[in-house]
Interface confidence: medium
Amino acid sequence: DTHKSEVAHRFKDLGEEHFKGLVLVAFSQYLQQCPFEEHVKLVNEVTEFAKTCVADESAENCDKSLHTLFGDKLCTVATLRETYGEMADCCAKQEPERNECFLQHKDDNPNLPPLVRPEVDVMCTAFHDNEATFLKKYLYEVARRHPYFYAPELLFFAARYKAAFAECCQAADKAACLLPKLDELRDEGKASSAKQRLKCASLQKFGDRAFKAWAVARLSQKFPKAEFAEVSKLVTDLTKVHTECCHGDLLECADDRADLAKYMCENQDSISSKLKECCDKPLLEKSHCLAEVENDEMPADLPSLAADYVESKDVCKNYAEAKDVFLGMFLYEYARRHPDYSVMLLLRLAKAYEATLEKCCAAADPHECYAKVFDEFQPLVEEPQNLVKQNCELFEQLGEYKFQNALLVRYTKKVPQVSTPTLVEVSRNLGKVGAKCCKLPEAKRMPCAEDYLSVVLNRLCVLHEKTPVSEKVTKCCTESLVNRRPCFSALELDEAYVPKAFNAETFTFHADMCTLSEKEKQVKKQTALVELVKHKPKATKEQLKGVMDNFAAFVEKCCKADDKEACFAEEGPKFVAASQAALA
């Protein structure tokens, strides 16, 4: 349905508060280096303009597209060329090329300082002094660091952030109340950002067919009682929502997400018995709740799939008639029966089934050719099952920190060309799969682990695309979305890699090490471990363990010394020499 003024339409649909929040997020995700005040000024100008269009949709410029309006506004920033370099060239383009240009310049790893958390009293004062500015600052700081963060979900995070301060700044022990809530929001926010980044990568790099396949599998697991038609409708709508958000169309995305939540709540009976408690909540919470809702129970008497997808003589006829629909139905049927499989495994099975039909439907006896297709699934199913089993055993044996170290060594040997900070970040996150998934019952382990790993490996792919250094990484990242994790798992020690020259500076430490938090200490040690492996890729586990144990002892000793800096200066070179000898 067309509207005379798109900006007026969205302002009226979303309301002023959400409109302003979403425009701030959009601008912050595009111009990640701009100061907060600049963005607030732009947002206020856009909001005032939107209000004039609400009052009179025929007013000047009100008929322009949102991309035109927002792009024109972004291009008024005076320091565009100095701050962003070639991104300023986007402003010479016409829509839709200009928006595409801005999208291409989004930076997944912007050169921004890490967010420092002030003292609780300082934060509470700022919150009370100007709550609106305080919350806008939160949206701005998160959005500029996470340029693909799911915008309507970020509004939900901001609402929780506000609620945490409103409650805790009145508590007797403000810090005890507030800090765990902020930690939880930070961790959930990072996870949400990474999950959304995979959705956007799926859409942008592999197309909407790939995203729709993912959505069919996931929604069929969540809503196994829903009919295929219902799942198809939800998939179509969800694809539109995510296409819009990933494309920077945040107002449309938020509006369509609200419509989808409304539809789901009005049609609970034909979707899932689990939606009821979500549907009683206010909008932002409702949408979040629906996205995270647990799987419904599987219908009791689902027949075997073999009858329709293997035994039927009409398989090739049906496949030929509408390939994607037939494969979609196969995926739906398989996924609703297997909440215990990862989405990526289900997609691999659908790909294998498709490949078999492509081959067999051209054969002399198609039925004979595809009769054993389900048997071919067995190795595909067993591979992630074994991987999860082995890695959970390793995690339980080592604990999280040492499990991360094992992964650091494993991945540095596979792709030693990748930058050390990236290897540390990715391996630390890969290692978190243990605590996240290994405690779950068997039936939930694989979907938790493999789908989480897909999210983490996407982060590696996104960072690597910005600065490509390894053909092996490029190959695993670009050849097949569903086979990324098996592709990385299959990589061996890179025999062609020329070991990095030893640099004593890399292994020189100072007294500031002692004041670091436990997490920061771990990162320092893990950075050293990656550098060691890059220097000696063929070092054994035992050799590396010996060096790392010595390192921990050396740091502990010097942090207990009266003159810490002198200790580091004296003991450091000894540690380096001993390490070189141990690895020789």
């Epitope: 009919e227 295929f228 038609a229 219902e230 198809s232 409708k233 179509t236 027949p303 799939l305 009858a307 329709d308 997808y309 039927s312 009409d314 006829k317 049906n318 030929a320 008639e321 509408a322 629909v325 037939f326 979609g328 139905m329 739906y332 049927e333």
Partner: nanobody
Framework: QLQVVESGGGLVQAGGSLRLSCAAS????????MGWFRQAPEKEREFVAG?????????DYADSVEGRFTISRDNAKNTAYLQMNNLKPEDTAVYYC????????????????????WGHGTQVTVSS
């Protein structure tokens, strides 16, 4: 929500022909079985014809219309058709198009409960 709209009904003499159309609002229409039902005054609604979820697949007819009626579908147009030849006065009824999601297989059922979405019907009157 999937919408179903019938058209093509009207008044025709016995022995004449009519072609009913049933348009569905969604592309995923291709995945459903389609059925035509009819209801004469003071009578129960009854199955007339069905076609399974792909154009090349199964069709099914009530004994009373077998050989006279033909069901077909055009997936590209999200539309199903009922070609009715050699019409008889007893064919007079409101004709309803219905879409089924019964899976797996999407075979055309004869049972009304197999069909989830219904049109409002189109009147067919056959005069003698």
């Amino acid at each position: 929500q999937l919408q179903v709209v019938e058209s093509g009904g009207g008044l025709v003499q016995a022995g004449g022909s009519l072609r009913l159309s049933c348009a569905a609002s969604e592309r995923t229409f291709v995945a459903y079985a389609m059925g035509w039902f009819r209801q004469a005054p003071e009578k129960e609604r009854e199955f007339v014809a069905g076609i399974s979820w792909f154009a090349g697949a199964t069709t099914d007819y009530a004994d009373s219309v077998e050989g006279r009626f033909t069901i077909s579908r055009d997936n590209a147009k999200n539309t199903a058709y009922l070609q009715m030849n050699n019409l008889k006065p007893e064919d007079t009824a409101v004709y309803y198009c219905a879409i089924s999601h019964q899976l797996p297989g999407g075979r055309p059922g004869r049972d009304m409960d197999s069909y989830s979405y219904w049109g409002h019907g189109t009147q067919v009157t056959v005069s003698s």
